[in-house]
Interface confidence: medium
């Protein structure tokens, strides 16, 4: 009714001292490798000489922080980041930062960025949209307040606002162009 | 360990104006955002702006002509203040760290304030 | 902006219990937080971006979602867990919102 050598599972590391023989009811916990998070029980015990429990260690990593338009990251590049790890940004001048300066890896997600925005207020060309253009010629630059307006492309039905507007240096949001069969 | 309080006067006069202050220990406010929000007796929670690790800060629209928020990361102590308060700002006041995805994760314990003459 | 609606906003319960309260979303976001609160203290992290447990928290909480329904479950509920439960969200696009509560009382 012993157990002899402990089974294997990806990514896992058996703790305390590795025996020849498990009697019966001896539990064994496992920890996950660097990176990876346990999904479920740690452990695995033996009854009637076999191994039962089956640890999962997962992946929760993360890599590539997100890209923050006018911003550089100031903090150390890696390859990959553990759960937890924060990745810190700077805006370049002229721009100012809005939102968390950092993003943090959380379980193999990153967490919303910043946003650097003109400081005047001013908004930089209208984001494009699937389908439609705006109506305007468009501009390097917007002033505070300043508005564009979208039209879509033949056979496609405008949904949202046509209008969109300059506010604290962001524009409001666009409008989609929808094909009538999927409104 | 990481800690929040919150302090001020428990009563102030209509028209005048709030002002709190959280003194943190624990973490900078160099690396770390701090929020404030409040909740009116009996009600739920009203988020009333935050101040980042920069020195930025966000504000409630529907507060934003009346709140200050500020920082001294030399005394650990970000301040909150609301002007022309009238009874309807009687609340419970929370400051809180930022976590990231506009989460929080570690709270003051509340102060208490009443708008009344 | 974005209106966080919580149903049930109360909800009686026994000690045992699996109980699950509703976060729904005016309009399509990311991710949603979760927060406990008892009579006359600050409230208390429970769940971070939809589904990642806050430290500390016991493994009988979970949360899941996405687009505009979220949902907090108690798998089986304990003595220590009657409180307030409120849903919460942020986008750089919309003010800070919390959802109205939910009131969990005993049975």
């Known amino acids: 009714t012993d157990c002899l050598s402990l089974p294997s599972f990806e990514n896992a590391i058996p703790m305390g001292e590795k025996k020849d023989v498990y009697k019966a009811g001896e539990q064994v916990t496992y920890t996950c490798a660097t990176y990876y998070k346990m999904d479920g029980a740690s452990n695995v015990t033996c009854i009637n000489s076999r191994w039962t429990g089956r640890p999962t260690c997962r992946d929760t990593s993360c890599v590539n922080p997100p890209t923050v338009q006018n911003a550089y990251i100031v903090s150390r590049q890696m390859s990959k980041y553990p759960s937890g790890e924060r990745v810190r940004y700077q805006c370049r001048s002229p721009y100012e930062m809005f939102g968390d300066e950092e993003v943090m890896c959380l379980n193999g997600n990153w967490t919303e960025p910043p946003q650097c925005k003109d400081s005047t207020g001013k908004c930089g060309p209208p984001p494009p949209i699937d389908n439609g253009d705006i109506t305007s010629f468009p501009l390097s630059v917007y002033a505070p307040a300043s508005s564009v307006e979208y039209q879509c492309q033949n056979l496609y039905q405008l949904e949202g606002n046509k209008r969109i507007t300059c506010r604290n240096g962001q524009w409001s949001e666009p409008p989609k162009c929808l094909h009538p069969c999927v409104i | 360990q990481v800690q929040l309080q919150e302090s001020g006067p428990g009563l102030v006069k209509p028209s005048q104006t709030l002002s709190l202050t959280c003194t943190v220990s624990g973490f900078s406010l160099t690396n770390y955002g701090v929020y404030w929000i409040r909740q009116h007796p009996g009600k739920g929670l009203e988020w009333i702006g935050v101040i980042w690790s920069g020195g930025t800060t966000e504000y409630n629209p529907s507060m934003k002509s009346r709140v200050t928020i500020s920082k001294d990361t030399s005394k650990n102590q970000v301040s909150l203040k609301l002007s022309s308060v009238t009874a309807a700002d009687t609340a419970v006041y929370y400051c809180a760290r930022n976590f990231g995805n506009y989460a929080m994760d570690f709270w003051g314990q509340g102060t208490s304030v009443t708008v009344s003459s | 902006d974005i209106q966080l609606t919580q149903s049930p906003s109360s909800l009686s319960a026994s000690v045992g219990d699996r109980v699950t309260i509703t976060c729904r979303a005016s309009?399509?976001?990311?991710?949603m937080h979760w927060y406990q609160q008892k009579p006359g203290k600050a409230p208390k992290p429970l769940i971070y971006?939809?589904?990642n447990l806050a430290s500390g928290v016991p493994s009988r909480f979970s949360g899941s979602g996405s687009g505009t329904d979220f949902t907090l479950t108690i798998s089986s509920l304990q003595p220590e867990d009657f409180a307030t439960y409120y849903c919460?969200?942020?986008?750089?696009?919309?003010?800070?919102?919390f959802g109205a509560g939910t009131k969990l009382e005993l049975k």
């Open positions: 971006a939809s589904s």
């Open positions: 309009t399509s976001v990311t991710y």
């Open positions: 919460q969200h942020r986008s750089s696009s919309n003010p800070l919102t």
